[in-house]
């Protein structure tokens, strides 16, 4: 359905408030260094222009594409070359190359100051003084730090952010009311950003087919009562939504996501029995709720998969006629029967099945060749099961902090070239799998753990892609999306690594560590641990544990001392000397 003016169409569909919010997100995700005021000015100009097009769709420039309009607007920024360097060259290009150029310059790790949370009273005053600006600032700050954040979902976060301030700034104890809510939004926001980043990486690095396969598996687990044709329709629509958002087409994305939520709710009888509550909610809550809805119950008496996919005489005929559809049916049937498997495992099984058919259907006796294909699945299923069992046992034995440390050591030895902040961030997140997933019963552990690990390892991949330093990381990240985790698991100690020169400065600590939060103190200690392993990759667990225990005791002692700084200086020297001796440095 072609519209005379795309900008007028989206303005009318979304309404002024959502239109302005989404344009702000889009601009902040592209120009991540621009000041807030500059973005607000650009958004207001675009909004005023959109209103003229709503009034008269034939008005000048109203027929231009959104990319043309937005790109032209971004290219009016005066300091583009000084602030962004070669990104300014994008403005010399024509659409669609210009937009592609902007996308390529999105920075997953922008050089921006950490967001420091002001005092509660200061925040409440700012909220009451100018609610609109306060909420816009939230959108801007999140969007520029998370350039792939799922825009319609960010609107939902902003709505919750506003509700938290509306409620808590009137409360007797503002801080007790507000701070837990803000912590929850921060943690959920980081998780949401990372999940969306994987979807965009999947689409951009491995293509639409890879994303669709992921979506078939996940939606089939979630909606096992839905027919294959219904799941296929949802997958097609969902792929369009995420392709748009990942491509910076945020207005279209939000509009299409709303349409998809509407369709799902209108057809919930043929999709899932779990959607009722979601579908009673307002739009943003509804879409979020559908995306998080629990798996429906599996239909009773599902027949054996072997009948259609191994025993049938038509396997090769059906496969040859419509390969992706037949593989999609296989994935759908397998996934709806296995909510206990991770999506990536299901995709590995489908890939194995595909490889077998490719080989066997060209053989003299196809059936004889593929008859035992399901036997090939056994080791693929057992590998993540065993890994999760072992790691959950280790987590239960050590607790989260020490489990993270075990992973820090493990991953630093695998890929010691990776920067210390990245190793700390990624290993800490890998370690969170324990508290997130090990509490679940067996049937929920694998989908929780392995699909979460896929999200975390993607963070490593996108951060590493910006400044590649390890061929092993590049290999695991680029060869196969579904085999990333097994690829990293299989890495042993990098024997080619030349240990880092010892630098006492790296292990010099000051009294400021005493005022840090527990989390920040852990990060300091974990940073030291990574550096230690980089200096002495062959250090044993026992050696590292002894040094870390000494370090913890040293911090505790000096933080209790009257003259903390002197303690850190003197005891620090002793600690460094003792550690060098213990590790044979």
């Amino acid at each position: 359905d072609a519209h005379k003016s795309e900008v007028a169409h989206r303005f009318k569909d979304l309404g002024e408030e959502n239109f302005k919010a989404l344009v702000l997100i889009a601009f902040a995700q592209y120009l991540q260094q621009c000041p807030f005021e500059d973005h607000v000015k650009l958004v207001n100009e675009v909004t005023e222009f959109a209103k003229t097009c709503v009034a008269d769709e034939s008005a000048e420039n109203c027929d231009k594409s959104l990319h043309t309009l937005f790109g032209d607007k971004l290219c009016t920024v005066a300091t583009l070359r000084e602030t962004y360097g070669e990104m300014a060259d994008c403005c010399a290009k024509q659409e669609p190359e210009r937009n592609e150029c902007f996308l390529q310059h999105k920075d997953d790790n922008p050089n921006l100051p950490r967001l420091v949370r002001p005092e509660v009273d200061v925040m409440c005053t700012a909220f009451h003084d100018n609610e609109e600006t306060f909420l816009k600032k939230y959108l801007y700050e999140i969007a520029r730090r998370h350039p792939y954040f799922y825009a319609p979902e960010l609107l939902f976060f902003a709505k919750r952010y506003k509700a938290a301030f509306t409620e808590c700034c009137q409360a007797a104890d503002k801080a007790a009311c507000l701070l837990p809510k803000l912590d929850e939004l921060r943690d959920e926001g980081k998780a949401s950003s990372a999940k969306q980043r994987l979807k965009c990486a999947s689409l951009q690095k491995f293509g639409e087919r890879a994303f669709k396969a992921w979506a078939v598996a996940r939606l089939s687990q979630r909606f096992p009562k839905a027919e294959f044709a219904e799941v296929s329709k949802l997958v097609t629509d969902l792929t369009k939504v995420h392709t748009e958002c990942c491509h910076g087409d945020l207005l279209e994305c939000a509009d299409d996501r709303a349409d998809l939520a509407k369709y799902i709710c209108e057809n919930q009888d043929s999709i899932s029995s779990k959607l009722k509550e979601c579908c009673e909610k307002p739009l943003l809550e509804k879409s979020h709720c559908i995306a998080e809805v629990e798996n429906d119950e599996m239909p009773a008496d599902l027949p054996s998969l072997a009948a259609d996919f191994v025993e049938s005489k038509d396997v090769c005929k059906n496969y040859a006629e419509a390969k992706d559809v037949f593989l999609g049916m296989f994935l759908y049937e397998y996934a709806r029967r296995h909510p206990d498997y991770s999506v990536v495992l299901l995709l590995r099984l489908a890939k194995t099945y595909e490889t077998t058919l490719e080989k066997c259907c060209a053989a003299a006796d196809p059936h004889e060749c593929y008859a035992k294909v399901f036997d090939e699945f056994k080791p693929l299923v057992e590998e993540p099961q065993n890994l999760i069992k072992q790691n959950c046992e280790l987590f239960e034995q050590l607790g989260e902090y020490k489990f993270q440390n075990a992973l820090l050591v493990r991953y630093t030895k695998k890929v010691p070239q990776v920067s210390t902040p990245t190793l700390v961030e990624v290993s800490r997140n890998l370690g969170k799998v324990g508290s997130k997933c090990c509490k679940h019963p067996e049937a929920k552990r694998m989908p929780c753990a392995e699909d979460y690990l896929s999200v975390v390892l993607n963070q490593l991949c996108v951060l590493h892609e910006k400044t590649p330093v390890s061929d092993r990381v590049t290999k695991c990240c680029t060869e196969s999306l579904v085999n990333r985790r097994p690829c990293f698991s299989a890495l042993e100690v990098d024997e080619t690594y030349v240990p880092k020169e010892f630098n006492a400065e790296t292990f010099t600590f000051h009294a400021d560590i005493c005022t840090l939060s527990e989390k920040e103190r852990q990060i300091k200690k974990q940073t030291a641990l990574v550096e230690l392993v980089k200096h002495k990759p062959k250090a044993t667990k026992e050696q590292l544990k002894a040094v870390m225990d000494d370090f913890a005791a040293f911090v505790e002692k000096c933080c209790k001392a009257d003259d903390k700084e002197t303690c850190f200086a003197e005891e620090g020297k002793k600690l460094v000397a003792a550690s060098q001796a213990a590790l044979g440095l």
Epitope: C316, A320, E321, A322
Partner: nanobody
């Protein structure tokens, strides 16, 4: 839109040969499996043969195995059916077909099909 144009049919004596061609357009031929089906007078559609997108996989109905050969030329967007040792029971209208999104695999009534080409085998 999808277009399939069959040619090469005609009258032939039992034991004779014919080569059918099907020129395709309006879709990505090189990523699509192709099928030959036939309809004998007063009968329903009968599947004859299938070839995969890359031509690595070919499958035949028992009734034509060893006599018919399916092939394709992705550069020319054309699929072929070489028919040897023809029999009276091979008399039918032969259709070239390809999968239509949303249809059931093997439900040939729902596939994209051409107009067909008539093959008559009689002494």
């Amino acid at each position: 839109q999808v277009q399939l144009l069959e040619s090469g049919g005609g009258e032939v004596q039992p034991g004779g040969s014919l080569r059918l061609s099907c020129a395709a357009s309006g879709f990505t031929f090189s990523t699509s499996g192709m099928v030959w089906v036939r309809q004998a007078p007063g009968k329903g559609l009968e599947w004859v043969s299938t070839i995969s997108d890359d031509a690595r996989i070919t499958v035949y109905a028992e009734s034509v195995k060893g006599r018919f050969t399916i092939s394709r030329d992705n550069a020319k967007n054309t699929v072929y059916l070489q028919m040897n040792s023809l029999r009276a029971e091979d008399t039918a209208v032969y259709y070239c077909a390809t999968y239509r999104a949303g249809s059931r695999i093997g439900s040939y009534e729902d596939y994209y099909r051409g107009q067909g080409t008539l093959v008559t085998v009689e002494p």
